[in-house]
Amino acid sequence: IWELKKDVYVVELDWYPDAPGEMVVLTCDTPEEDGITWTLDQSSEVLGSGKTLTIQVKEFGDAGQYTCHKGGEVLSHSLLLLHKKEDGIWSTDILKDQKEPKNKTFLRCEAKNYSGRFTCWWLTTISTDLTFSVKSSRGSSDPQGVTCGAATLSAERVRGDNKEYEYSVECQEDSACPAAEESLPIEVMVDAVHKLKYENYTSSFFIRDIIKPDPPKNLQLKPLKNSRQVEVSWEYPDTWSTPHSYFSLTFCVQVQGKSKREKKDRVFTDKTSATVICRKNASISVRAQDRYYSSSWSEWASVPCS
Amino acid sequence: RNLPVATPDPGMFPCLHHSQNLLRAVSNMLQKARQTLEFYPCTSEEIDHEDITKDKTSTVEACLPLELTKNESCLNSRETSFITNGSCLASRKTSFMMALCLSSIYEDLKMYQVEFKTMNAKLLMDPKRQIFLDQNMLAVIDELMQALNFNSETVPQKSSLEEPDFYKTKIKLCILLHAFRIRAVTIDRVMSYLNAS
């Protein structure tokens, strides 16, 4: 048993049929010695008396808010949560496996630049009685500070019969140098509590590996005289690290017909313009990627050819 | 159509082209190592990230772009040099700061070159003959060092009398390649920045 926060405790349980329960001794936080009784949750029934209560925790029915009282007055509370371990593996019932980039990916994180700011998100089908708490650091043995905000519900989607909820959190490394070469990964830890179930999820990454630039901005077409060709120009996204000559991007320019089956023409360039043939009803899209470290491509920025 | 990026004009900043070749070569070598050594811990998640140049050179700090010198986190509580305008020891007068940056890059390359050559000698002794260092990568390191045109003491190749542990050598190779790739990215950024200056 360990303390998650004040008056909230996590009991770690081996979850197999013939596992013995965990013996827990609850102590009433009071100088009083006599006349103390204990209750659980909304029930007014007395479960025991005395300054301590020894219980066996084996089921979710044994978890909950234990309260000690004296003469009708509440003295203190202890909320017990359960963390299940099945076949030596901690349960992951609360969050959905996103399976990208690999199986057992519950947290996904992205950064728009090298400033040390990043966003993580996760999915669940649970809509109520759910809380998240996020902590992060650079390295684990001698951790350096990363500050994370509160996790918020960022999207709701319908997937077949189920509703899916996306939560996200923004974090910022306390003293980040965009030019630094990372040798210690960022660690992100999410505590998830659903009713009386506790789970924790972790992700470890280097900022350089989760970079995904915003799409190029100000995408414009300039027709070339007496030609089917157009000059496409764009700019670096505002959110990209500066100076751009140091943090350079490379670009992919794509000409796509109306039909998805039509052949796509693609050009790769380090410049912020390119000359392409603009077909009728086609659209031109441009995306960006770090020129020197191949992490994710940005989403496409698009303009119609017309 | 997949059109490759155009190569820089010969008249451009002389080291840019070499640094781009270096990054390409080390990235290819790392990819080859990860495929060949698929049952070894060779991915970024599995290896320990060690920097053999740590406390010996200070390339990141010495080559910091002017715009980032206002960022206290980049100064890392050291006496930091930063690069100003100039070229890769070409005809224009090179500032002291810039020379410090480029000499730091040169020292990095020299250290990695020695490590890679020592490692290759060990790998050539492996009866499995599983993996060797790409000669192209070693050549590209050499070319960039020549372009930087520094004269410094030649570091003797490390020789070891004991029987090599090939498993450990291959893991060390992965660690070295990951670290060198990160340094090659920094070098490329620096050269790109200098080219624009």
């Epitope: 013939d18 659980l40 029915g61 | -």
Partner: antibody, heavy 119, light 107 residues
């Protein structure tokens, strides 16, 4: 006052189905799991299993798994034990009981339902 | 599963006497053992839980002791209403199991 009131005695033929009930009152139904115990004529007590009234989480005694089904209706604070195809060997007194949280034993019991299966 | 063996199977005693019933587990159950009383035609009633804790409303003449594998239920001075069948139950490991019962009869 805590009370567990069970449905009346049943006489059934082999192969028939049956569902007996246990209605709880006088306490917070969702705080306490409900269990079932069998007592064959002239015999001792046998633990069938327990279930959560909150989310129908169930723990069966392997000996009874597949033989009986436990269920619960939160809205009426009622627990059920059912058989899809009775056998003569199911003849017994069945007790529902309230599981004490933080312990696991049964602190309050229903009066029992006698089930007789005979052709 | 854990087997609980009660002894004796039948105990003859007179009102006012002290009665002791033993319950032995085939493996340790810690302190997670309860005692129940069952009278003819009635449901069992909880007497003792966690080996030695008296259930609310049960007279103080009933007491329990033991831990691990050996447990004892003691009735310090028998009253006429105490003559019944007594069962021990372990609730440490699933499936929870009962002893075969001890019949306490009037001598």
């Amino acid at each position: 006052e805590v009370q567990l009131v069970q449905s009346g005695a049943e006489v059934k033929k082999p192969g028939e189905s049956l569902k007996i009930s246990c209605q709880s009152s006088g306490y917070s139904f969702t705080t306490y799991w409900i269990g079932w115990v069998r007592q064959m004529p002239g015999q001792g007590l046998e633990w069938i299993g327990i279930m959560s009234p909150v989310d129908s989480d169930i723990r069966y005694n392997p000996m009874f798994r597949g033989q009986v089904t436990m269920s619960v209706d939160k809205s009426s604070s009622t627990a059920y034990l059912q058989w899809s195809s009775l056998k003569a060997s199911d003849t017994a007194m069945y007790y529902c009981a309230r599981r004490r949280p933080g312990q696991g034993y049964f602190d309050f019991w229903g009066q029992g339902t006698m089930v007789t299966v005979s052709s | 599963e854990i087997v609980l063996t009660q002894s004796p199977a039948t105990l003859s005693a007179s009102p006012g006497e002290r009665a002791t019933i033993s319950c032995r587990a085939s493996q340790s159950v810690g302190s997670w053992l309860a005692w129940y009383q069952q009278k003819p035609g009635q449901a069992p009633r909880s007497l003792i839980y966690a080996a030695s804790n008296l259930q609310s409303g049960i007279p103080a003449r009933f007491s329990g002791s033991g831990s691990g594998t050996d447990f004892t239920l003691t009735i310090s001075s028998l009253e006429p209403e105490d003559f019944a069948v007594y069962y021990c139950q372990q609730y440490n490991i699933y499936p929870y199991t009962f002893g075969q019962g001890t019949r306490l009869e009037i001598k």
